[in-house]
């Protein structure tokens, strides 16, 4: 089983970053950390999408990774996609320092995110509380600013 993974986020223009993943035990939480730069100040949706396909850039990554066929939510919600990691927050310099611990994603098994695409979005994720249909699918996070396929790391 892989215990570490990494993702290089690449986008149109200034948005780019590197995100690391570590899971010490197969059923344990995954630590997610790294940095994304070139963002506008504020909250940006942060999700694992289903496909590790970047043929058309971030467009071809498909919907949020959702093997349990649930509605979109926040990372602390029972009702959420596996890929729902909430928001990252960019400071006034456009840098988001990411530090997340999540117990739903995994680096092995049915919830494995390796080979899928990590996406940072244009707008804040409303965590499924937006009151419209789009909120229950995407959190109204808007377009995909940067993305990368999550790969095994040493």
């Amino acid at each position: 089983m892989a215990t570490k993974a990494v993702c290089v986020l690449k986008g149109d223009g200034p948005v780019q970053g590197i995100i690391n993943f570590e899971q010490k035990e197969s059923n344990g939480p995954v630590k997610v950390w790294g940095s994304i730069k070139g963002l506008t100040e504020g909250l940006h949706g942060f999700h694992v999408h289903e496909f590790g396909d970047n043929t058309a850039g971030c467009t071809s990554a498909g919907p949020h990774f959702n093997p349990l066929s649930r509605k979109h939510g926040g990372p602390k919600d029972e009702e959420r996609h596996v890929g729902d990691l909430g928001n990252v927050t960019a400071d006034k310099d456009g840098v988001a320092d990411v530090s997340i611990e999540d117990s739903v994603i995994s680096l092995s098994g049915d919830h494995c995110i390796i080979g899928r695409t990590l996406v940072v979005h244009e707008k804040a994720d409303d965590l499924g509380k937006g009151g419209n249909e789009e909120s229950t699918k995407t959190g109204n996070a808007g377009s995909r600013l940067a993305c990368g396929v999550i790969g095994i790391a040493q």
Partner: antibody, heavy 119, light 110 residues
Framework: EVQLVQSGGGLVQPGRSLRLSCAAS????????MHWVRQAPGKGLEWVSG????????GYADSVKGRFTISRDNVKNTLYLQMNNLRVEDTAVYYC????????????WGPGTLVTVSS | LPVLTQPPSASGTPGQRVTISCSGS????????VYWYQQLPGTAPKLLIF???QRPSGVPDRFSGSKSGTSASLAISGLRSDDEADYYC???????????FGGGTKLTVL
């Protein structure tokens, strides 16, 4: 100047091969997925193939799978399409393109190059 | 056959409003953004609408896009003779892992 310059088209017999090239300039080529789109005479546009910025993801239309190969050289800022076992129905103007997408607001198309497959 | 369905032709007189439809499925229009291109004879396509309803700078506000469910439409108001062209809708298809185009609509200004 931001542009895509295409070369490599021409007349070829069925079953033969041809390689198209598309040289990019004026923008960070290695930031973008790139594509080939074709248009048969008097017909509509058809996506042929696409390749991610780092060649990690590649896709083809069913009509060309197994015969065409897309590749890129980010040092030379060039996109390629190797076309083997060409058929009469492959006759078209081939465009290389940075297509509009989630993160591409300003697309860019090459001028197109005509490939004619005929005996 | 094209995955996205457009009427082959549309027409209108100068000053009129014309709408071009584009019908798809849940794996393309239903899941992803729609783009509209204009193609004048002998030239490469030009982007008119991105992300369903956004206009790139330089495209007049006479052009507007909308999307509902698995269908999209392009509206052109204040029709002009230089709007005579072919119009294509495009979307990424998650099932096919491909960009899919409509068959194109030839717009004639009478």
């Amino acid at each position: 100047e931001v542009q895509l310059v295409q070369s490599g088209g021409g007349l070829v017999q069925p079953g033969r091969s041809l390689r198209l090239s598309c040289a990019a300039s004026g923008f960070p080529f290695d930031d973008y997925a790139m594509h080939w789109v074709r248009q048969a005479p008097g017909k509509g546009l058809e996506w042929v193939s696409g390749i991610s910025w780092n060649s990690g993801s590649i896709g083809y239309a069913d009509s060309v799978k197994g015969r065409f190969t897309i590749s890129r050289d980010n040092v030379k800022n060039t996109l390629y399409l190797q076309m083997n076992n060409l058929r009469v129905e492959d006759t078209a103007v081939y465009y290389c393109a940075k297509l509009a997408g989630d993160i591409v607001v300003i697309p860019l198309w090459g001028p197109g190059t005509l490939v004619t497959v005929s005996s | 056959l094209p995955v996205l369905t457009q009427p082959p032709s549309a027409s209108g007189t100068p000053g009129q409003r014309v709408t071009i439809s584009c019908s798809g499925s849940s794996s393309n229009i239903g899941s992803n953004y729609v783009y509209w291109y204009q193609q004048l004879p002998g030239t490469a396509p030009k982007l008119l609408i991105f992300r369903n309803n956004q206009r790139p700078s330089g495209v007049p506000d006479r052009f507007s896009g909308s999307k509902s469910g698995t269908s999209a439409s392009l509206a052109i108001s204040g029709l002009r003779s230089d709007d005579e062209a072919d119009y294509y809708c495009v979307a990424w298809d998650d099932s096919l892992s491909a960009w899919v185009f409509g068959g194109g609509t030839k717009l004639t200004v009478l």
